[in-house]
Structures are given as C-alpha cells and as structure tokens.
C-alpha cells in the first residue's frame, strides 16, 4: 500500500486513491494556473517510465519557493521508495532536455491518467 | 479538428498481409490510445486492440494474438493496424478509432470518441 | 472473456415514442480504479459508429439529451426518451474494463 496524504493521514490510502489525489492536485494546478506556474522555472524533462514518480521529485525538488507545488512534491515523496533531495538525479532524466514546470505538469498528468485508466498503481 | 483519415480500400489474397494506416489531424497522438475496431459484412462491431502511441503499449483481443501488430509514428501523427495470415473471414471493414482526456477533469476518459472513416479489406482467392 | 449480450435484437417503434435498449455483461464491469467504462455507439448504415455514452450514463458533447444511460454491475440501459426519425440506427454497448474489450451484438432500432 501506498501510504500518502497529510501528516494528520489515519492510516495507509489505497494506491488508486493515492493516484486519484495526486491527479486531482495536478488538475487543481494547471486550472488555477494565472501567471507562469513557478515563475516560468524550467526543469529536467524525465522518461515516463517505470520509477518515474522518484525521477519526477527528482526534477521538481530543485524548484524551490514555488508553493504551487509543494503539495506535488510532497505526494510524490509518498511514491517514491528512497528519499530524494535537490540535486540528485537518476538515470530516468532526459539531461540535455529542460521544459517549463507548467509543461512538466501537463506531461506528468497525461501519464498519470493513463495509469490510472489501465489500472496501475503503483 | 478532429480528423482520422484511413488508407483506401485493399483486395489480397488468403495468406498474405494488410496494413491500414490511420492519419491524425487536430490533435497529438501522444495524448491519446488509438483503437482498432472491425466489422464484418453484415455483423457487429469486433474491437481487436489498441496502442498508446506515447510509449507503444498495445493491447491485443487474444484471437487476434500473434497475427495483429497495432504501431504507431508520433512524427507523422499515424496509427497503422498490420493483420497477417488472411483468410477469408478477415474480410471487413476495419476503423481506427481514439480515446483522449483533457486537462482539466480528474477522471475524463472519453471511450472511442472519434472515428476514421473506415477500410473495406476483401480476402479473396 | 466479458460477454456483452444485448436485447432485443430488433426493436421496433414509431417516431416520438420511448425506446429502452438493454445490455447485460456476462460479469460484473467494475475496473480495478472503480469506474464502469461501459459505453454506447450508435451506427447507421454505410457510417461510422458515433460515441453517445461513456462511463455508464455520462453523455458525450453535442449528444442530445434524449440520450440517457443508467445501470450498474452487470444490468445496463441506453433510453431514447422521444424518437426522432435520425435516431433509427443500430446501437452498441462496449465494455472497456477488462481487456479483452468487448462490444455486444447490437440492437437494430427499425421504424415501425
């Protein structure tokens, strides 16, 4: 089990309502997104594959004073197996390619619905 | 908007192969699974599988297995449905089809909400 | 496999009434994330099918609202409120939860 949500979280959330969240704060930012989401702050683009939630916090980590995203960051941190810290990266990383966190976003989410149509959780 | 334009129509023999190509407009096929879907002369509906062109995962209908290889060209924006081994009771007319989500609903998967205009693939000795 | 079987096979009715198509799945259609992709089409001869329904009762856009979908679990139903003369065509359910993805027989909605 997934074990996601506030610190207050009763208990282990089950990983399709952990995935739905997620996507439920992803959708939240790109609707209420007025200026640039983070200042127009790019990041690394990562291979959306398997261990993509750590490569994700990976690259979102190294936005600091975005409060945007903190709540996605912390929700990625309940995906990830290891503990991440900025300026670590893994091999998932597309290095020689940076995009906009907005597109980052959108990216992530597509992928994530898809997951979760298919049923894939974790 | 929104297009699906299929290849023309194909006679072939029992035994021999068929690829049908599917050409996207209006949207990016990353964003979305495109289906395949065929009917015979006078029957239903028969879905046979699908690809996420993002990534090319494929979905097969097990009868299918084996013989039905479902790709995708993002650069083109093309989905292609190759069926090999024809015999006769493969000839029907064969749909593309896609499904998409928007950004702004959580859960808005939108089953087959556009389809090609179709393909008439006769097998015939 | 799900087995998508739908009745009647023929339906028969005059403009302006009430048509009730029902599809029934061989198992419960429930995905694993909890929603039914159950679906309807509607073909007509020579054409493509065309989505009207998708996830059990939501309407698809520029779908009239005449057009209605309700069931649950294994018992669905496509419902015409008022016929119009375009609405003769041959509708279809589609399950999408469980791959295989399977569409039923259809029913043929004929003037009568």
């Known amino acids: 089990l997934t074990c996601l949500g506030g610190f207050a979280s009763p208990g282990p959330v089950p990983p399709s309502t952990a995935l739905r969240e997620l996507i439920e704060e992803l959708v939240n930012i790109t609707q209420n997104q007025k200026a640039p989401l983070c200042n127009g702050s790019m990041v690394w683009s990562i291979n959306l594959t398997a261990g993509m939630y750590c490569a994700a916090l990976e690259s979102l980590i190294n936005v600091s004073g975005c409060s945007a995203i903190e709540k996605t960051q912390r929700m990625l941190s309940g995906f990830c197996p290891h503990k991440v810290s900025a300026g670590q990266f893994s091999s998932l990383h597309v290095r020689d390619t940076k995009i906009e966190v907005a597109q980052f976003v959108k990216d992530l989410l597509l992928h994530l619905k898809k997951l979760f149509r298919e049923g894939q959780f974790n | 908007q929104v297009q699906l334009v299929q290849s023309g129509a194909e006679v072939k023999k029992p035994g021999s192969s068929v690829k049908v190509s599917c050409k996207a407009s209006g949207f990016y096929i990353k964003d979305t699974y495109m289906h395949w879907v065929r009917q015979a002369p006078g029957q239903g509906l028969e879905w046979m599988g699908t690809i996420d062109p993002a990534n090319g995962n494929t979905k097969y209908v097990p009868k299918f297995q084996g013989r039905v290889t479902i790709t995708a060209d993002e650069s083109t924006s093309t989905a292609y449905m190759e069926l090999s081994s024809l015999r006769s009771e493969d000839t029907a007319v064969y749909y593309c089809?896609?499904?998409?989500?928007?950004?702004?609903?959580?859960?808005?998967?939108?089953?087959?909400?556009?389809w090609g205009q179709g393909t008439l693939v006769t097998v015939s000795s | 496999d799900v087995l998508m079987t739908q009745s009647p096979g023929t339906l028969s009715l005059s403009p302006g009434e009430r048509a009730t198509l029902s599809c029934r799945s061989s198992?419960?259609?429930?995905?694993?994330?909890?929603?039914?992709?159950l679906e309807w089409y509607q073909q007509k001869p020579g054409q493509a099918p065309k989505l009207l329904i998708y996830k059990i009762s939501d309407r698809f856009s520029g779908v009239p609202d005449r057009f209605s979908g309700s069931g649950s679990g294994t018992d669905f139903t496509l419902t015409i409120s008022r016929l119009e003369p375009e609405d003769f065509a041959v509708y279809y359910c589609f399950q999408g939860s469980h791959v295989p993805w399977t569409f039923g027989q259809g029913t043929k909605l004929e003037i009568k």
């Open positions: 089809a896609r499904s998409i989500y928007d950004d702004y609903h959580v859960d808005d998967y939108y089953a087959m909400d556009y």
């Open positions: 198992q419960n259609i429930v995905h694993i994330n909890g929603n039914t992709y």
